[in-house]
Interface confidence: low
């Protein structure tokens, strides 16, 4: 919990350099996101593929989409869960991070110093040990987050199942309902290839309680979809006289104390015939 208040932003006096004043963990250990670069990577053969169970949400059910002033968040049911970690981790929500139209490089994690256009986080909590995400969030490895790196490319109909509702949640506190769809469609190809490390929430209170899985391969969304994400939302309430656009809602990469990042893949990319031409 913060020392006092709960006001934080990505820009200005309450921006990330000030987070640790109110949220001490933000200046502590195991902070995320990080830069994924060769010096800190180590192959771990025990990192087997994860199974995504209950991810195919019924189209007959509606799921709450919210503008929380920091991102756009979709609530997820707890029967949706990951199998393959040491405990069962049940889903609680997903949200995104992005840049702005003039600098569309807003992923939180970077690879060899390079940002992707945006990043999706699917947040899960250890439901074997804890009754809900809130309880789990300050317990060691209480949370597991799947991170999907997003690059600009071709139109992505699955992501549009969220983006098509952005106009209904333009302002902080606004809510809309999204019909269920297969959340697994939001994941990239070859989900067996991922980075794994122990880190934190990337937003206050920055609890160092997250088991991160960052998929190696990005997904693509179109320039138009990215632009919609970068321009549709505001951090402020509808009646706020000083509206603030929801842009650049990503945290800078953090110092990587003593840790290694484990990879489920050996780092040499296999050259295809096409790649050799």
């Amino acid at each position: 919990a913060p020392v006092n208040g709960s006001k934080w932003t990505y820009f200005g006096p309450d921006g990330e350099n000030s987070w640790s004043k109110k949220y001490p963990s933000c200046g502590g250990l195991l902070q995320s996101p990080i830069d994924l670069h060769s010096d800190i990577l180590q192959y771990d053969a025990s990192l087997t593929p994860l199974e995504f169970q209950g991810y195919n949400l019924s189209a007959n059910k509606q799921f709450l989409l919210t503008n929380n002033g920091h991102s756009v968040k979709l609530n997820l049911p707890s029967d949706m869960h990951i199998q393959g970690l040491q405990s069962r981790y049940s889903a609680t929500q997903l949200h995104l991070h992005w840049g702005n139209p003039n600098d569309p490089h807003g992923s939180e994690h970077t690879v060899s110093g390079q940002h992707f256009a945006a990043e999706l986080h699917i947040v899960h909590y250890n439901s074997d040990l804890y009754p809900d995400a809130s309880t789990a969030s300050n317990k060691s490895e209480g949370l597991a987050v799947l991170a999907v790196l997003i690059e600009m490319g071709s139109f992505n109909p699955s992501y549009d199942k969220i983006f098509s509702h952005l106009q209904h949640v333009k302002y902080k506190g606004q809510e809309a309902f999204v019909p269920g769809f297969n959340i697994e469609e939001l994941l990239p190809e070859r989900t067996a290839e991922y980075y794994r490390y122990r880190g934190s929430l990337t937003t206050p209170p920055c609890n160092p309680t997250v088991l991160w899985t960052v998929f190696r391969n990005p997904v693509q969304i179109s320039q138009e979809q990215l632009l919609a994400l970068e321009t549709a939302l505001y951090c402020t309430h509808m009646d706020d006289p000083s509206p603030r656009e929801m842009i650049n809602n990503f945290r800078q990469v953090q110092k990587f104390d003593e840790r290694l990042v484990y990879t489920s893949f050996s780092q040499v990319q296999v050259c295809t015939a096409a790649g050799l031409s």
């Epitope: 180590q42 060691s140 490895e141 122990r198 110092k255 104390d257 840790r259 290694l260």
Partner: antibody, heavy 120, light 107 residues
């Protein structure tokens, strides 16, 4: 091979400062945190704090914050710990250690220890 | 701070014995438990990290186990050179904390 060589024993007056050096060799100094550990006579081990030689970021145990300063000299791959305003409570053997890589939060190599005696 | 408790402060055993030293944390430390050996002259060595991983150069007669709050170090076939004090240490949170130590002596 990895080695951490500490400076010799010191006898200091109460109220004086003491500075211990830890000269490292056999590995890349800036790639590993250096930790400092205290052991009072006949007692257990106490973690004082750690320093990242790459940028001198320190993390100190609250208990030692007011009188301990950790520094490094990258040119000589040497870490230093200074204890100010010494009292008899600071009489101890001090160890410098290297933090293991891999997120296991262990200390894989230790110096031989430096004995500090505070006495008038 | 997390308290680390080694209930047995000293232990006598015979050469060739199987010896187990235990350590308890005041809260779940998620297997971030390390064991060190301190020889009578003061030399300290890492034996085991992350509950059960043997540090390079450490004889295979040393092993570690445990989870949650309870951990143990086992020496399967005690040798003369194992006479030392053994400390556990948690790496889950700062400040790092150690157990009080268990002194192993020959009976």
């Amino acid at each position: 091979q990895v080695q951490l060589q500490q400076s010799g024993p010191q006898l200091v007056w109460p109220g004086a400062s003491v500075k211990i050096s830890c000269n490292t060799s056999g590995y890349s100094f800036t790639n590993y945190w250096i930790h400092w550990v205290k052991q009072r006579p006949g007692q257990g081990l106490e973690w004082i704090g750690m320093i990242d030689p790459s940028d001198s970021e320190t993390r100190l145990n609250q208990k030692f914050k007011d009188k301990t300063t950790l520094t490094v000299d990258r040119s000589s791959s040497t870490a230093y710990m200074q204890v100010s305003s010494s009292t008899s409570e600071d009489s101890a053997v001090y160890y410098c250690t290297r933090g293991i890589r891999g997120g296991y939060y262990a200390m894989d190599y230790w110096g031989q220890g430096t004995s500090v005696t505070v006495s008038s | 701070d997390i308290q680390m408790t080694q209930t047995t402060s000293s232990l006598s055993a015979s050469l060739g014995d199987r010896v187990t030293i235990s350590c308890r944390a005041s809260q779940d430390i998620s297997n971030y438990l390390n064991w060190y050996q301190q020889k009578p002259e003061g030399t300290v060595k890492l034996l085991i990290y992350y509950t059960s991983r043997l540090h390079s150069g450490v004889p295979s007669r040393f092993s570690g186990s445990g989870s949650g709050t309870d951990y143990s170090l086992t020496i399967s076939n005690l040798e003369q050179e194992d006479i030392a004090t053994y400390f556990c240490q948690q790496g889950d949170t700062l400040p790092r904390t150690f157990g009080e130590g268990t002194k192993l002596e020959i009976r």
